[in-house]
Amino acid sequence: RAPRCRELPAQKWWHTGALYRIGDLQAFQGHGAGNLAGLKGRLDYLSSLKVKGLVLGPIHKNQKDDVAQTDLLQIDPNFGSKEDFDSLLQSAKKKSIRVILDLTPNYRGENSWFSTQVDTVATKVKDALEFWLQAGVDGFQVRDIENLKDASSFLAEWQNITKGFSEDRLLIAGTNSSDLQQILSLLESNKDLLLTSSYLSDSGSTGEHTKSLVTQYLNATGNRWCSWSLSQARLLTSFLPAQLLRLYQLMLFTLPGTPVFSYGDEIGLDAAALPGQPMEAPVMLWDESSFPDIPGAVSANMTVKGQSEDPGSLLSLFRRLSDQRSKERSLLHGDFHAFSAGPGLFSYIRHWDQNERFLVVLNFGDVGLSAGLQASDLPASASLPAKADLLLSTQPGREEGSPLELERLKLEPHEGLLLRFPYAA
């Protein structure tokens, strides 16, 4: 008799793939543009990335550091009207893209939460949650919560409002903190909160340290659903050298939880490469004309257009990983087991019941390495086969689909491998 199938866990929409942050509409759309109507025209692009949710804004009225002139119910006219927003919501829904609205109140000011008028601001947020839930948004984000006094209790209250409306609504909180204890204290009183932080930002680009950070986090958070990113708002290139971008994409898409990216992460957008562009929100490079300030500054391989035409590009890798993440049971909600693979490497298995299983091996170092996969670290339910098929490598040159002997696995500098193998009873 065949073994009984394991019962599938309840899956919320944010469990099924990545979230994509567009914090600055104008930078995302390019000079001379930057409104909700224009964003509607970019939804097909978001669909092509197979992201499940768009984290938008803030887009509300906010006069810097002025509580009275901050209205969380009103869209800043520079971004468009409530009608434009409704139209965007409708279009996004048709494309199965959920919309999460950032309600960080004083987003243009010195302190995101107007440090002196916490209760007034908290009431404004409460009213805004109810208003925008009625308008049809799928969730909310609030950032810089380390600046919000009594953050845990406010988050619990906002979570109740959000979940009270529908279990299918999401609340994301963002913090600049990278301290695990601070992060855990924010999480412990808020069961379903998705928290983005700087926890992984000091992973130091070594396999051992990254492995230790990831496993500590997963052990500390237990069975709760995690999110994975390097910060609450910034681009991956703010933290990583270019040669590690592919590796981190592979890792973020295959860890158990929701990967969260900022616009431009999929093409390796780097503000530091573009004079005059701010770290917070550089202009999105749709094509070579997106940065007209210095003729010739942008080459085709830096742009969406150029990378879309190149199957070996970072964008193509992002699309493939996003696709795998959203359709493979083991990646959607599978168990996670990290194990030793040798110095400089981070490796783990994702598996769910009798479904296809995935092995991830990441070489963070700048020298080629032989992987010594220590299968003895793994439980019996997650044992390794002698061979696994190469689904993809972050480096060009490997023959995809070919079986690789796991005992003889060699990785190039900064290479990540995603391998698949079948369940064996």
């Epitope: 104008q26 000079h31 001379g32 243009r108 010195e110 503000a271 004079p275 300030d293």
Partner: antibody, heavy 112, light 106 residues
Framework: QVQLVQSGAEVKKPGASVKVSCKAS????????MHWVRQAPGQGLEWIGN????????NYNERFKNRATMTRDTSTSTVYMELSSLRSEDTAVYFC?????WGQGTLVTVSS | EIVLTQSPATLSLSPGERATLACSVS?????IHWVQQKPGQAPRLWIY???KLASGVPARFSGSGSGTDFTLTISSLEPEDFAVYYC?????????FGQGTKLEIK
């Protein structure tokens, strides 16, 4: 073409404040952050901070955080940098820059 | 903050010679920029994104490097090249400059 035109030289007493202006033309003012950089006599360049003309968000170098204030007036495409509690070490040429283009500089002399 | 250290502080060379200016960064960055400044003038963006020449910069200039070590090279010095060159990082706040290398005529 792009021009950043700064206000004229200033002489101030220690403890006073100074407000330097930078009028931009030749590009869309709200599309580019403006930075302030200073250079003491015979010294190198020091970044003070930046401002997003679209909304007024600012970042400051910690060294100047409590003394520098950057503002903007979108109606005149002008950014301002005010430095308070001046001391003799603040004697310098202050530049506004869009990074691609620089203003001509404003000499601020602090002397009793 | 990220500290940039330039060497040498002063480089004395004759026109026609090759100049190599170094910039060492205290922690790894993806790109640096170089600005040129002549006496009594505002600085000018000279090389950006490590190796790209700003508008109007002659092809005898080149930039290279990655991580923590970057170089500006002038293949054959012309009289107008003598100036102070600063490297700058804009990968994290606060943006910082090196202390400058003064390129002077020997």
């Amino acid at each position: 073409q792009v021009q950043l035109v700064q206000s004229g030289a200033e002489v101030k007493k220690p403890g006073a404040s100074v407000k330097v202006s930078c009028k931009a033309s030749g590009y869309t003012f709200t599309s580019y952050w403006m930075h302030w950089v200073r250079q003491a006599p015979g010294q190198g360049l020091e970044w003070i901070g930046n401002i997003n003309p679209n909304g007024g968000k600012t970042n400051y170098n910690e060294r100047f955080k409590n003394r520098a204030t950057m503002t903007r007036d979108t109606s005149t495409s002008t950014v301002y940098m005010e430095l308070s509690s001046l001391r003799s070490e603040d004697t310098a040429v202050y530049f506004c820059t869009r990074e691609i283009d620089w203003g001509q500089g404003t000499l601020v002399t602090v002397s009793s | 903050e990220i500290v940039l250290t330039q060497s040498p502080a002063t480089l004395s060379l004759s026109p026609g010679e090759r100049a190599t200016l170094a910039c060492s960064v205290s922690s790894s960055v993806n790109y640096i920029h170089w600005v040129q400044q002549k006496p009594g003038q505002a600085p000018r963006l000279w090389i950006y994104s490590t190796s790209k020449l700003a508008s109007g910069v002659p092809a005898r200039f080149s930039g290279s490097g990655s991580g923590t070590d970057f170089t500006l090279t002038i293949s054959s010095l012309e009289p107008e090249d003598f100036a102070v060159y600063y490297c700058q990082q804009r990968s994290s706040y606060p943006y910082t400059f090196g202390q400058g290398t003064k390129l002077e005529i020997k």
